[in-house]
Amino acid sequence: TPEVWVQVRMEATELSSFTIRCGFLGSGSISLVTVSWGGPNGAGGTTLAVLHPERGIRQWAPARQARWETQSSISLILEGSGASSPCANTTFCCKFASFPEGSWEACGSLPPSSDPGLSAPPTPAPILRAD
C-alpha cells in the first residue's frame, strides 16, 4: 500500500522559518503534490504550494521556495513573519495525487521536543483517500 511521509523542521538560523519535506512511498506516477497547513487539503487546510512534475510549481505566502527533491519527494521552505507565520504546533499536510488511480495524504508537525535544526525522522502517517 502506498504511503506518504511528512517531516517538519525548524531552521536553526531563523526560528520562524520552517522546512517541510514530504515523500511518496509507492510505485505509482505522481501527477500533482499539494502542501497545505491547518489540516488536510480538502478539510479546512489552506494550500501553500502545488507542484506538478511537468508544468511547474505554484506557491502562496508564506511559502518561500517549493521544489522537487526527487521524482517522489518535495520540500517547501516557509518564511515566518507576521500574522501568517507558522507556529510550533502548526499541522502541515502533503497530498500526492496520481490521477485517476487515487490520492494519498499525510500530516505532520514539529516534534514537541525537537531542537532547532534537528530533523525528526520521517514518520509515515497516511490518510488513505480512495478517490
Epitope: S31, L32, T34, S36, N41, G42, A43, G45, T46, T47, V50, H52, R55, G56, R58, W60, K95, A97, F99, P100, S103, D131
Partner: nanobody, 120 residues
C-alpha cells in the same frame, strides 16, 4: 473532503448527444479550475474542457464546436454537453477540480468517472 459525483454517461449512436453532470461538495482552498478529463481504453488521459475561475471555458481541439462546458454555481454543479458524438469520444469521463498551470487544469480531486460509449 471534496467529493465529485458524475452522471449522464451511457451508450449513444454516432452523431448523437449526451449531457454529463457533476455534483460537487466540499472545498479545497485556492483551486481555480474545474473541468472534464477522459481516458479511452489503451490511450493516454486527456483534458477535454475546463472552466477557469474567471469563467472562461477552454476546450481541447478535438471537441471544439461539439462540446460545451457550463457551471451552475447555485447547485455546485458542472456540466458537459456533448453533441455530434464520434466513436473516438468513447472513454471514461472524469469530473475534476484542480489548479491552473497555464492553459492546463491539473486535477487535485476527481470523481469515480462515468463511461461514455459511442457505437452503432
Amino acid at each position: 473532503e471534496v467529493q465529485l459525483v458524475e452522471s449522464g454517461g451511457g451508450l449513444v449512436q454516432p452523431g448523437g448527444s449526451l449531457r454529463l453532470s457533476c455534483a460537487a461538495s466540499g472545498y479545497t482552498s485556492r483551486t481555480d479550475c474545474m473541468g472534464w478529463f477522459r481516458q479511452a481504453p489503451g490511450k493516454e488521459r486527456e483534458g477535454v474542457a475546463h472552466i477557469d475561475s474567471d469563467g472562461i471555458p477552454r476546450y481541447v481541439e478535438s471537441v471544439k464546436g461539439r462540446f460545451t462546458i457550463s457551471q451552475d454555481h447555485a447547485k455546485n454543479s458542472l456540466y458537459l454537453q456533448m453533441n455530434s458524438l464520434r466513436a473516438e469520444d468513447t472513454a471514461v469521463y472524469y469530473c475534476v477540480v484542480g489548479f491552473k498551470f497555464g492553459d492546463y487544469c491539473a486535477p487535485n480531486d476527481w470523481g469515480q468517472g462515468t463511461m461514455v460509449t459511442v457505437s452503432s
